[in-house]
């Protein structure tokens, strides 16, 4: 079943290469288990950046070595991507799946364009 997911159009990463945005999905109510996947689109290529499953009882849990962190509240997920470099500039798409209980719903946002500007290196000081 289809479901709407919303995310901001543009986000500017911090000088430390950290970008945060909210992914909001249309609630079917009583979704006990939700999977959130962050996809990066570059041209026609779509790659998975990170993914996490959370339950109505427990917090969002990304893998320990993930480049993402996040918190969940109701039908909103606050996602943070770390370690971004200028070459990481691109369209980041939030995909939300309501896994349990049935019926299964899936929704994809239109994507958030994340701009990453590498900081200028500090000049050498004598």
């Amino acid at each position: 079943k289809g479901m709407h997911a919303a995310q901001p159009a543009v986000v500017l990463a911090s000088s430390r290469g950290v970008a945060s945005f909210v992914c909001e999905y249309g609630s079917s109510g009583n979704a006990a288990e939700v999977r959130v996947t962050m996809l990066r689109q570059a041209g026609s290529q779509m790659t998975e950046v990170c993914a996490a499953t959370y339950t109505v009882e427990d917090e969002l849990a990304f893998l320990d070595d993930s480049t993402c962190t996040g918190t969940s509240s109701g039908n909103k997920v606050n996602l943070t991507i770390q370690g971004l470099r200028a070459m990481g500039t691109g369209l980041y798409i939030c995909k939300v799946e309501l896994m349990y209980p049935p019926p299964y719903y899936v929704g994809m946002g239109n994507g958030t364009q994340i701009y990453v500007i590498d900081p200028e290196p500090c000049p050498d000081s004598d």
Epitope: S28, A32, T55, V56, E57, M99, Y100
Partner: antibody, heavy 116, light 112 residues
């Protein structure tokens, strides 16, 4: 704390109707499905079905289609089980139980006795 | 419908013994995305059931570590490493993977 409190015991005659309530507190009522479970005297647990507390959509197990109805009073964080045209075999304890990815908590149970 | 068959029906044990309860499903209860919604509940006399284990092997918070769940596909086991008096009651397995969701028939744990 999170709890479900059910209405008291009922004594009914065959053919009558009963409505059992289950009042939730300590959490957001519409975030979790509410399930109903039957336990006949000295018997095991039998899943009756559940109601989506956000949409109001009920799902019934085959044995509980027809005379049984789940409903909600969302503003009062209360779920209801109504049984019409009562039969002797409806004599049992009925539990409501909140479900996310498991059942917790359960109501204390409502004992229904159907006897002429 | 998925039939959940528990064995034994009755399990007499001595305090301190290990107890093992089996639960078999009539078909695989792996849900579409890979999770298995197999749970274990304990119902003490005159009380409502309480969750012990969810998703096959996850112990609910506050449940003693002498309780453990295992299994996959159609074959599941609840083990109690050292039975204590407070563990006595009826144990039920439950599958929440395929509607209609179903309980096992129950296993009564009692003192030998």
């Amino acid at each position: 704390q999170i709890q479900l409190v059910q209405s008291g015991p009922e004594l009914k005659k065959p053919g009558e109707t009963v409505k059992i309530s289950c009042k939730a507190s300590g959490y957001t009522f519409t975030n979790y499905g509410m399930n109903w479970v039957k336990q006949a005297p000295g018997k095991g647990l039998k899943w009756m079905g559940w109601i989506n507390t956000y949409t109001g959509e009920p799902t019934y197990a085959d044995d509980f289609k027809g005379r049984f109805a789940f409903s909600l009073e969302t503003s009062a964080s209360t779920a209801y089980l109504q049984i019409n045209n009562l039969k002797n075999e409806d004599t049992a304890t009925y539990f409501c139980a909140r479900r996310g990815t498991y059942y917790r908590p359960w109501g204390q149970g409502t004992t229904l006795t159907v006897s002429s | 419908d998925v039939l959940m068959t528990q064995t034994p029906l009755s399990l007499p044990v001595s305090l301190g013994d290990q107890a093992s309860i089996s639960c078999r499903s009539s078909q695989s209860i792996v849900y579409s995305h890979g999770n298995t919604y197999l749970e274990w509940y304990l119902q003490k006399p005159g009380q409502s059931p309480k969750v012990l284990i969810y998703k096959v092997s996850n112990r609910f918070s506050g449940v003693p570590d002498r309780f453990s769940g295992s299994g996959s596909g159609t074959d599941f086991t609840l083990k109690i490493s050292r039975v204590e008096a407070e563990d006595l009651g009826v144990y039920y397995c439950f599958q929440g993977s395929h509607v209609p969701w179903t309980f096992g028939g129950g296993t009564k744990l009692e003192i030998k």
